[in-house]
């Protein structure tokens, strides 16, 4: 099907009406599915709108307002999904379609195939010449429960309106027998849980149909309630992962499809990315775009999403000489600085000559997200009440691609600094280090700086800081849990490496193997938390002996094969069917009888659970992915 993007201009239009018409035509010519809103506004009376006949489906709302044409030829529009609503209420809004000072205006709605509005109401008002709209049985079209304030259809037309053709039983879109409204819901047998194609119990449409059908199967629908998978209406598209009953794990499904609007597609359109099995225009802020096997996908960021920013003297900050109060906000959420970070007195304390206020020291916390500086770090001024550079606690690499007089790290004359606290710094790729005249700085002498270097010609000048013996005398020494590799400052989180064990970046005496709120196992010298599905053990027993839900001593909830799970598989997509299991008295999961298609409480066909008139559409993912 040919898909086009909708608009969201509401009532605003181009001042040139010719342009307005051309834009409408360009948007919707040969378009079958409008992915968004269909807005038809400010169109003159003599315009050819026959191109609108191609439209079959609108995912958002339909707005028809401020027009002068006589007939709205949306003759093939079957369904308005109402994923976005006009004024947050209406899926269909038709108003003010007449010329105030003349005889032009909307007389007839050509919506003869409109049989479904999935969400939202209808507003048809102030259409001076409009006929027949008030004869339509809107309750048959509108799916959601019927709040009277959500549908307003006034008797728009003048007294000159004709009647419906006698074969239409009083409900029509226009005057002839071809204009009768087709009812697909209010005429159905009460056993039908959706729409129908006749009055008998045998005439119910499949529950996945929207807008009616020509037969009982999921392939007979006029439109789909949820998704169209190669002509069949389905609750969900074939999932990326399917449950393998042999391995008790979710495994990659090579028949997976992605949701694109209301369609299941093998591949997203080229300008879309995959996010959780859906085709989206852009990744949400908590995810980043990556390419895997030629497919652009949204992957959750482990911490903060990568964001590269210009450094001082680069790109948008080409004119800046220092980080200052007028540019510091440009560093919010940056993980990589392309260029340099420079801190001069004119930035930290302000520069009245140049209309720059002093920096609020709290704002320096923006640098906590920075992991890489590709150029140099030059600190020649720092707020007097800040005794360390812990705002750079996540800085891993100083690239030194650009150097300051041969230096990639310069810390000069900072009397208030007592420790560096560059606790994540692992590499200074190029350039020399110059840390001098910081009269209160300690801990610097415990570090073997050359381990940070990438080349043999890098040099270190560290002098005229606080004497090492004075630091030791005042107890400004590495924490006892640090190894002999040294530290960046006081505390067990500042060690270059640990004497015993580590939890995250903190050095500890021992892992929580047998006690503590969160139990752990030892992976070498690293303490790793047990899987959340493991039950916390007492009496000197290990809670787990490795990672994952298959290494628990005992399960916290249920056990599916070797894996501890939150609950037994309940509608997980398998290779060919949905997987349902029940829990035995020992809380172990076992497959339901093959006849049970909606779950069970035991092994036999008599234990099946049956939900009348509903589709089983909540399919939680409780199994383990490899």
């Amino acid at each position: 099907q040919s898909v086009c993007a909708g608009t969201e201009n509401k009532l605003s239009s181009l001042s040139d009406l010719e342009q307005q018409y051309r834009a409408l035509r360009k948007y919707y010519e040969n378009c079958e599915v409008v992915m968004g809103n269909l807005e038809i506004t400010s169109i003159e009376h003599n315009r050819d709108l026959s191109f609108l006949r191609s439209v079959r489906e609108v995912t958002g709302y339909v707005l028809v307002a401020l027009n002068q044409f006589r007939y709205l030829p949306l003759e093939n529009l079957r369904i308005i999904r109402g994923t976005k609503l006009y004024e947050d209420r209406y899926a269909l809004a038709i108003f003010l379609n007449y010329r105030k000072d003349g005889n032009f205006g909307l007389q007839e709605l050509g919506l003869k195939n409109l049989t479904e509005i999935l969400n939202g109401g209808v507003y048809v008002d102030q259409n001076k010449f409009l006929c027949y709209a008030d004869t339509i049985h809107w309750q048959d079209i509108v799916r959601n429960p019927w709040p009277s304030n959500l549908t307003l259809v006034s008797t728009n037309g003048s007294s000159g309106c004709g009647r419906c053709h006698k074969s239409c039983t009083g409900r029509c879109w226009g005057p002839t027998e071809n204009h009768c409204q087709t009812l697909t819901r209010t005429v159905c047998a009460e056993q039908c849980d959706g729409r129908c194609y006749g009055p008998y119990v045998s005439d119910c449409c499949h529950r996945e149909c929207a807008g009616g059908c020509s037969g009982p199967k999921d392939t007979d629908c006029f439109a789909c309630m949820n998704f169209n998978d190669s002509g069949a209406c389905v609750t969900q598209c074939p999932q990326t992962f399917v449950y393998n009953p042999t391995t008790f794990q979710l495994e990659h499904n090579f028949n997976a499809k992605y949701t694109y609007g209301a369609f299941c597609v093998k591949k997203c359109p080229h300008n879309f990315v995959v996010d959780s099995s859906s085709c989206v225009r852009a990744c949400p802020s908590s995810k980043m775009e990556v390419e895997e096997n030629g497919i652009k996908m949204c992957k959750p960021c482990t911490d903060i999403c990568p964001k590269a920013c210009d450094g001082i003297g680069t790109g948008s900050l080409m004119s800046a000489q220092t980080v200052d109060s007028s540019n510091i906000d440009k560093f919010i959420n940056c993980t990589k600085i392309n260029g340099n970070l420079i801190f001069l007195v004119t930035g930290i304390h302000g520069d009245p000559y140049n209309a720059i206020e002093a920096i609020d020291p709290e704002k320096l916390n923006v640098f906590r997200t920075v992991r890489e500086i590709t150029g140099f770090l030059n600190i020649q001024s720092w707020p007097p009440n800040m005794t360390d550079f812990s705002v750079f606690s996540n800085l891993v690499t100083i690239g030194g691609r650009v150097l300051y007089s041969g230096l990639s790290l310069l810390i000069l004359k900072q009397q208030g600094i007592t420790s560096l606290q560059f606790q994540s710094l692992k590499e200074i790729s190029a350039g020399n280090i110059y840390i001098t005249d910081n009269s209160n700085l300690c801990y610097y002498h415990t570090i073997n700086w050359t381990t940070l270097f990438s080349t043999i010609n890098q040099r270190i000048v560290i002098r005229d800081n606080r004497k090492a013996e004075n630091c030791t005398a005042e107890g400004m020494v590495c924490n006892h849990l640090c190894s002999s590799d040294g530290c960046w400052g006081p505390g067990p989180d500042q060690c270059l490496s640990c004497r015993r064990f580590s939890r995250g970046r903190i050095c500890i005496e021992s892992c929580n193997l047998y006690d503590g709120e969160f139990r752990e196992f030892e992976n070498g010298s690293i303490c790793v938390e047990c899987d959340p599905q493991c039950e916390k053990m007492e009496d000197g027993l290990l809670t787990c002996h490795g990672p994952g839900p298959d290494n628990c001593t005992k399960c916290s909830h249920f056990k599916d094969g070797p894996n501890c799970v939150e609950k037994c598989p309940d509608g997980l997509q398998g290779a060919n069917s949905f997987i349902f299991k029940y829990a035995d008295p020992d809380r172990e999961c076992h497959p339901c009888h093959p006849n049970c298609t909606q779950g069970c409480n035991g092994p036999t066909s008599h234990d099946c659970i049956y939900y009348p008139w509903t589709g089983h559409s909540t399919l939680p993912q409780h199994a383990r992915t490899p």
């Epitope: 004119s319 007028s326 009245p352 000559y353 140049n354 720059i356």
Partner: antibody, heavy 113, light 110 residues
Framework: QVQLVESGGGVVQPGRSLRLSCAAS????????MHWVRQAPGKGLEWVAV????????YYADSVKGRFTISRDNSKNTLYLQMNSLRAEDTAEYYC??????WGQGTLVTVSS | QSALTQPASVSGSPGQSITISCTGT?????????ASWYQQHPGKAPKLMIY???NRPSGVFNRFSGAKSGNTASLTISGLQAEDEADYYC??????????FGGGTKLTVL
């Protein structure tokens, strides 16, 4: 060497507008804040306005606030002063300055009916 | 933004020393070390003589010196010379991020 050349002065009626320009050369214009200072005939210096290097901060003397607008175009190395609702007391020599050292030679604005 | 207070005129003989005062408030002169002094000859643009209370730009003779006490800045010219005859203005940064000048002092070399 730093050079600042003001232009755009002239005679204008009260209530009308005028735009002064200051062409800068001999330094990296886009890295410095710039000021306007004026001096009425036979009177003392009066500071008028300042703009930061990137245009993000602007400050004005109370006497011109709401009537004058300082702006800059870093791509053209030019500073501007848009003067609206001019009054007789705005008559002065207007200097552009790179504080505190470098000043232009000034341009004369006369507000008279 | 009231102008800083300077004496309207001072005078001295060649070779003598004179001092020009500039009184403000704690919101300008007293609150910041951004007091400057400018010399202006008739028909010419102002010339910076002292910046940041006591610093001399290159090219300014060391006969010119600046100081500050409380809310008052001062400019001292020693070894007065005929070419020192001019108007002198003090200038200070203020707490509202603006700048303010003094009313000016006419120096006459007798």
């Amino acid at each position: 060497q730093v050079q600042l050349v003001e232009s755009g002065g002239g005679v204008v009626q009260p209530g009308r507008s005028l735009r002064l320009s200051c062409a800068a050369s001999g330094f990296t214009f886009s890295s410095y804040g710039m000021h306007w200072v004026r001096q009425a005939p036979g009177k003392g210096l009066e500071w008028v306005a300042v703009i930061s290097y990137d245009g993000s901060n602007k400050y004005y003397a109370d006497s011109v606030k709401g009537r004058f607008t300082i702006s800059r175009d870093n791509s053209k190395n030019t500073l501007y002063l848009q003067m609206n609702s001019l009054r007789a007391e705005d008559t002065a020599e207007y200097y552009c300055a790179k504080y505190p050292l470098n000043w232009g030679q000034g341009t004369l604005v006369t507000v008279s009916s | 933004q009231s102008a800083l207070t300077q004496p309207a005129s001072v005078s001295g003989s060649p070779g003598q020393s004179i001092t020009i005062s500039c009184t403000g408030t704690s919101s300008d002169v007293g609150g910041y070390n951004y007091a400057s002094w400018y010399q202006q000859h008739p028909g010419k643009a102002p010339k910076l003589m002292i910046y940041e209370v006591s610093n001399r730009p290159s090219g300014v003779f060391n006969r010119f010196s600046g100081a500050k006490s409380g809310n008052t800045a001062s400019l001292t010219i020693s070894g007065l010379q005929a070419e020192d005859e001019a108007d002198y203005y003090c200038n200070s940064y203020t707490s509202s991020s603006t700048w303010v000048f003094g009313g000016g002092t006419k120096l006459t070399v007798l």
